[in-house]
């Protein structure tokens, strides 16, 4: 699987999950989240050659098409597969609230 | 929705479904499919700016990150959303077989 265990410990050139730290204020302009100040969101990057963790029959077809037509702009793209939530603290007035923001952290990628 | 109805009738620059005809022999090297000789597979293409048909909370975060960090390689990608099957005819010996190949045709796209 193209997950953090494999990708973070390898020098994989193809589609894989990469490390990305996002600071809520600096990178998003969000001031409403009190904690954490930022988080390891990660992101997906890398080419999707034929047979590389292809998502659907269509992805396989498109990767093969791309192999036969190298100059084509039609190619599968490396995108998130497994996403995890992020717990945050924000304030309503003076009262702190804890909430889980769903689908915030990329754990693995796929070619779609 | 970024579907064929909208995308094929507009000059949309952002993520949208685009027309793509795939010839099984020429483009994939497949000789085993008897009919059809090819099909309109379509593909997804175009940038994914903030708020443009974003798939998950993560996609929104990443698009916003990209807006604040324009040079970054981390950005959402335009990928298939709705896929449809394709009926095909192939031969087992001299006997024709009809089968549905699932997830073969892109009907709409999303930013993931």
């Amino acid at each position: 699987a193209l997950d953090t265990n494999y990708c973070f410990s390898s020098t994989e050139k193809n589609c894989c999950v990469r490390q990305l730290y996002i600071d809520f204020r600096k990178d998003l302009g969000w001031k409403w989240i009190h904690e954490p100040k930022g988080y390891h969101a990660n992101f997906c990057l890398g080419p999707c050659p034929y047979i590389w963790s292809l998502d659907t029959q269509y992805s396989k077809v498109l990767a093969l098409y791309n192999q036969h037509n190298p100059g084509a702009s039609a190619a599968p793209c490396c995108v998130p597969q497994a996403l995890e939530p992020l717990p945050i603290v924000y304030y309503v007035g003076r009262k702190p609230k804890v909430e889980q923001l769903s689908n915030m952290i990329v754990r693995s990628c796929k070619c779609s | 929705a970024l579907d064929t109805n909208y995308c094929f009738s507009s000059t949309e620059k952002n993520c949208c479904v685009r027309q793509l005809y795939i010839d099984f022999r020429k483009d994939l090297g497949w000789k085993w499919i008897h009919e059809p000789k090819g099909y309109h597979a379509n593909f997804c293409l175009g940038p994914c700016p903030y708020i443009w048909s974003l798939d998950t909370q993560y996609s929104k975060v990443l698009a916003l990150y990209n807006q604040h960090n324009p040079g970054a390689s981390a950005a959402p990608c335009c990928v298939p959303q709705a896929l449809e099957p394709l009926p095909i005819v192939y031969y087992v010996g001299r006997k024709p077989k009809v089968e549905q190949l699932s997830n073969m045709i892109v009907r709409s796209c999303k930013c993931s």
Epitope: D23, R25, K31 | -
Partner: antibody, heavy 117, light 102 residues
């Protein structure tokens, strides 16, 4: 490399105020929270407050509310901590420390403040 | 305020032996915890952030584990240079309180 250089030792009488500085270099000063902490002699660490130099937003430990003021000068990449109405219990080593990724990753060398009559 | 409780308060260790320090939070802090080492006369030094991540330049004999309310700092093989006071600190809403130190 990241460097936080603090002002020297200060001696104050009870009731007075003290203002110490922390000059930052080697990173984007405006886009990282700066924490202030202290450590009384032979005691543990205590978090006092933090400031976001980019917009001046602050979070204070309620224990110091009304006595503690955090400011930042983005033209010189310098953070300031002012503590008023000093008492002998405020005698401590005062630290500035950069906030990063759920931690304070770089610390100043500390500034000793002694409150004595 | 969240209360951080460290155990033990004192830990004598022979060089080459493993050591572990526990830190308990009075409420769920998820993985928002850091560990520091303070040597005599020095500023604290970050060892572990986000409960399990080794800070830059920290030897691999140090490791952190846990999430929620219970956390552990482990030293696989203690060296003489590891002497000092170890602190845990939470980052789950201000004020960011520390353990008493070990």
């Amino acid at each position: 490399q990241v460097l936080l250089v603090q002002s020297g030792a200060e001696v104050r009488k009870p009731g007075a105020s003290v203002k110490i500085f922390c000059k930052a270099s080697g990173y984007s000063f405006t886009s990282s929270w700066m924490n202030w902490l202290r450590q009384a002699p032979e005691q543990g660490l205590e978090w006092m407050g933090q400031i976001y130099p980019g917009d001046g937003d602050t979070n204070y430990n309620g224990k110091f509310k009304g006595r503690l003021t955090l400011t930042a000068d983005t033209s010189t990449n310098t953070a300031y901590m002012e503590l008023s109405s000093l008492r002998s219990a405020d005698t401590a080593m005062y630290y500035c420390a950069r906030h990063y990724d759920g931690s304070t990753d770089y610390w100043g060398q500390g500034a000793l403040v002694t409150v004595s009559s | 305020d969240i209360v951080m409780t460290q155990t033990p308060l004192s830990l004598p260790v022979t060089p080459g032996e493993p050591a572990s320090i526990s830190c308990r939070a009075s409420e769920n802090i998820y993985s928002n915890l850091a560990w520091y080492l303070q040597k005599p006369g020095q500023s604290p030094r970050l060892l572990i952030y986000a409960a399990t991540n080794l800070a830059d330049g920290v030897p691999s004999r140090f490791s952190g584990s846990g999430s929620g309310t219970d956390f552990t700092l482990r030293i696989s093989s203690v060296e003489a240079d590891d002497v000092g006071v170890y602190y845990c600190q939470h980052f789950w809403g201000t004020p960011y309180t520390f353990g008493q130190g070990t």
